[in-house]
């Protein structure tokens, strides 16, 4: 399907809105430090030169990839070396090399101050004033935070940001309006970014074939009583997209995700029953809805997998003949009998499967070899099943809070090297997982949980690959994708670590602290808490909870006092004595 | 060993109710399928009702809207609840689940229904 010139193919297939929008997100991923200007007169740049190119598909430079096309613009850039160092070293190399070097240094940690909502009157008057360049600022605001964030799914969130401000901008409360909207945003914002980092890590760091396996679990579970024939054709298409928007090719992946949501409601019949209302909609709203759709009904007969995988002479035959799409098979009907399974147990019991297959059937009985075989799933089952069932019993004993605190001690102690930021950000979400899973019926936690934690731990992977200092971290991390979070389980203290030397400034405090949101205030304490435990890596829940709970009574009694800084300045050098003798 | 548990049968008046339940032990596997069969004196085995890990359910037109099939995840149990009776339903009533090694049945227990 080659066309004369990329970009006019391209700008004609996607519209020019969704086309600016989304060269403005990949020039925003790309130089993150770049002004808001700066980016939009590139846009416009390129966005003229499209229409040059639709409008004559033979005019010059319009037959340029789309790499060369857009690197070429990025590296016209001027303060390049000054504001991004050696990625301007880029700009001297030629495609494709050039976009993986731009790849290369993308920033999943910019130094960028954190977003400031203004006023809700102040944004409605901008929102007003200019409504384009409002929604820009969304696109750049964001896209330049989260540089792998799922192009074509951040423009849905830009649409929606707009219906939020048209809506509540005429509202006669607009605040009680606008902001539940905008934290639902927010949060949905940061978990989708989080959940496509997984997604480009998998891609990234462990191929295609790991993120083909992770699909055919997934879309089985979703869709089965779809054929595996089927299955296969969604889990290639999604394959290529993702491949796309990871490598920033984010014109070709919307592009292609929009004809993969044509294809599925087109196929709605062969593929699952639950595609009907989200086939009505608008296209963002549509591949939105498809994305996220229900579980479809089981079949009601689908017969036990012995016969097929177990107790056949075949075994062998079938596996040598198509390794791959034996294996599939297998992870698809596995998936589709077990929506209440994770993704990643489903993957760890199809590497399992894999692992005996090519044990036995190299052996002299292979039958006799792997007859056993689904008695090695035993503990893999077990594992995480025991883990959602423990967490969830101390998630309910203690509430959010102290439930992250409980983690921010864990996680501490087996990578005390990790930053304090990090460790804190990582355990306040890992710490999420209560009150988005333990509250659902038994039979969807597992998902739910382990799934989402494998999300985080990502998080984790990622800050630290930027820089590295544990080798725990970088082995739990590096070694398998699918073992990742059972690896975290399984680190204990690590008794090689020399504890921080105590520094009384980190464990002073200000009247500041009296001001702070109750989120922020929960912050300050837990990096209080990771640095304890730094510095105390041996120290019981009973001595650390003794501090917190006196360093949360000196707080109080400080934000109540009249002259509140003298307070912090008497009381603090006492807090800090007494949790010394206490921790001694 | 898989070890099925079944109780809950006896007699009851015609537009009574009886609840039957089955509680499965000795799997390293979830129960992907649990379901209720019946054989009256006879006849051919029949399926009652099953329900589904995502708790799909399907039941036999003659039961529909009587009969109520449930399961307790975390206990691996599989009840039916059966109401207004008719003598129609008398006969033993088996359990079945499965996993992805096998099918299992149950023992059976009696349901009589009569005035």
């Known amino acids: 399907d080659t066309h004369k010139s990329e970009v006019a193919h391209r700008f004609k297939d996607l519209g020019e809105e969704h086309f600016k929008g989304l060269v403005l997100v990949a020039f925003s991923q790309y130089l993150q430090q770049c002004p808001f200007e700066e980016h939009v007169k590139l846009v416009n740049e390129v966005t003229e030169f499209a229409k040059t190119c639709v409008a004559d598909e033979s005019a010059e430079n319009c037959d340029k990839s789309l790499h060369t096309l857009f690197g070429d613009k990025l590296c016209t850039v001027a303060t390049l070396r000054e504001t991004y160092g050696e990625m301007a070293d880029c700009c001297a190399k030629q495609e494709p090399e050039r976009n993986e070097c731009f790849l290369q240094h993308k920033d999943d940690n910019p130094n960028l101050p954190p977003l400031v909502r203004p006023e809700v009157d102040v944004m409605c008057t901008a929102f007003h004033d200019n409504e384009a360049t409002f929604l820009k600022k969304y696109l750049y605001e964001v896209a330049r935070r989260h540089p792998y964030f799922y192009a074509p799914e951040l423009l849905f969130f830009a649409a929606r940001y707009k219906a939020a401000f048209a809506e509540c901008c005429q509202a006669a409360d607009k605040a009680a309006c606008l902001l539940p909207k905008l934290d639902e945003l927010r949060d949905e914002g940061k978990a989708s970014s989080a959940k496509q980092r997984l997604k480009c890590a998998s891609l990234q760091k462990f191929g295609d074939r790991a993120f083909k396996a992770w699909a055919v679990a997934r879309l089985s579970q979703k869709f089965p009583k779809a054929e595996f024939a089927e299955v296969s054709k969604l889990v290639t298409d999604l394959t290529k997209v993702h491949t796309e928007c990871c490598h920033g090719d984010l014109l070709e992946c919307a592009d292609d995700r929009a004809d993969l949501a044509k294809y599925m409601c087109e196929n709605q019949d062969s593929i699952s029953s639950k595609l009907k209302e989200c086939c009505d909609k608008p296209l963002l709203e549509k591949s939105h809805c498809l994305a996220e759709v229900e579980n479809d009904e089981m079949p009601a007969d689908l017969p036990s997998l012995a016969a097929d995988y177990v107790e056949s002479k075949d075994v062998c035959k079938n596996y040598a003949e198509a390794k791959d799409v034996f294996l599939g098979m297998f992870l698809y009907e596995y998936a589709r009998r077990h929506p209440d399974y994770s993704v990643m147990l489903l993957l760890r019991l199809a590497k399992a499967y894999e692992a005996t297959l090519e044990k036995c059937c190299a052996a002299a009985d292979p039958h006799e070899c792997y007859a056993k075989v689904f008695d090695e799933f035993q503990p893999l089952v077990e594992e995480p099943q025991n883990l959602v069932k423990q967490n969830c019993e101390l998630f309910e004993q203690l509430g959010e809070y102290k439930f992250q605190n409980a983690l921010l001690v864990r996680y501490t102690k087996k990578v005390p090297q990790v930053s304090t930021p990090t460790l804190v950000e990582v355990s306040r979400n890992l710490g999420k997982v209560g009150a988005k899973c333990c509250k659902l019926p038994e039979a969807k936690r597992m998902p739910c949980a382990e799934d989402y934690l494998s999300v985080v731990l990502n998080r984790l992977c990622v800050l630290h690959e930027k820089t590295p200092v544990s080798e725990k971290v970088t082995k739990c991390c590096t070694e398998s994708l699918v073992n990742r979070r059972p690896c975290f389980s399984a680190l204990e203290l690590d008794e090689a670590y020399v504890p921080k030397a105590f520094n009384a400034e980190t464990f002073t405090f200000h009247a500041d602290m009296c001001t702070l949101s109750e989120k922020e205030k929960q912050v300050k304490k837990q990096t209080a808490l990771v640095e304890l435990v730094k510095h105390k890596p041996k120290a019981t829940k009973e001595q650390l909870k003794g501090v917190m709970d006196n360093f949360a009574a000196f707080v109080e009694k400080c934000c109540k006092a009249d002259d509140k800084e003298a307070c912090f300045a008497e009381e603090g050098p006492k807090f800090v004595a007494a949790s010394q003798a206490a921790l001694a | 060993q898989v070890q099925l548990q079944e109780s809950g049968g006896g007699l009851v008046q015609p537009g009574g109710s009886l609840r039957l339940s089955c509680a499965a032990s000795?799997?390293?596997?979830?129960?992907?399928?649990m379901a209720w069969y019946r054989r009256a004196p006879g006849k051919e085995r029949e399926l009652v009702a099953l329900?589904?890990?995502?708790?799909?359910?399907n039941y036999a037109d003659s039961v529909k809207g009587r009969f109520t099939i449930s399961r307790d995840y975390a206990k691996n149990t599989v009840y039916l609840q059966m109401d207004s009776l008719k003598p129609e339903d008398t006969a033993a009533y088996y359990c079945?689940?499965?996993?992805?090694?096998?099918?299992?049945w149950g023992q059976g227990t009696q349901v009589t229904v009569s005035s």
């Open positions: 000795g799997s390293i596997f979830t129960f992907y399928r």
């Open positions: 079945n689940v499965r996993n992805v090694e096998r099918d299992y």
């Open positions: 329900i589904t890990t995502d708790t799909s359910t």
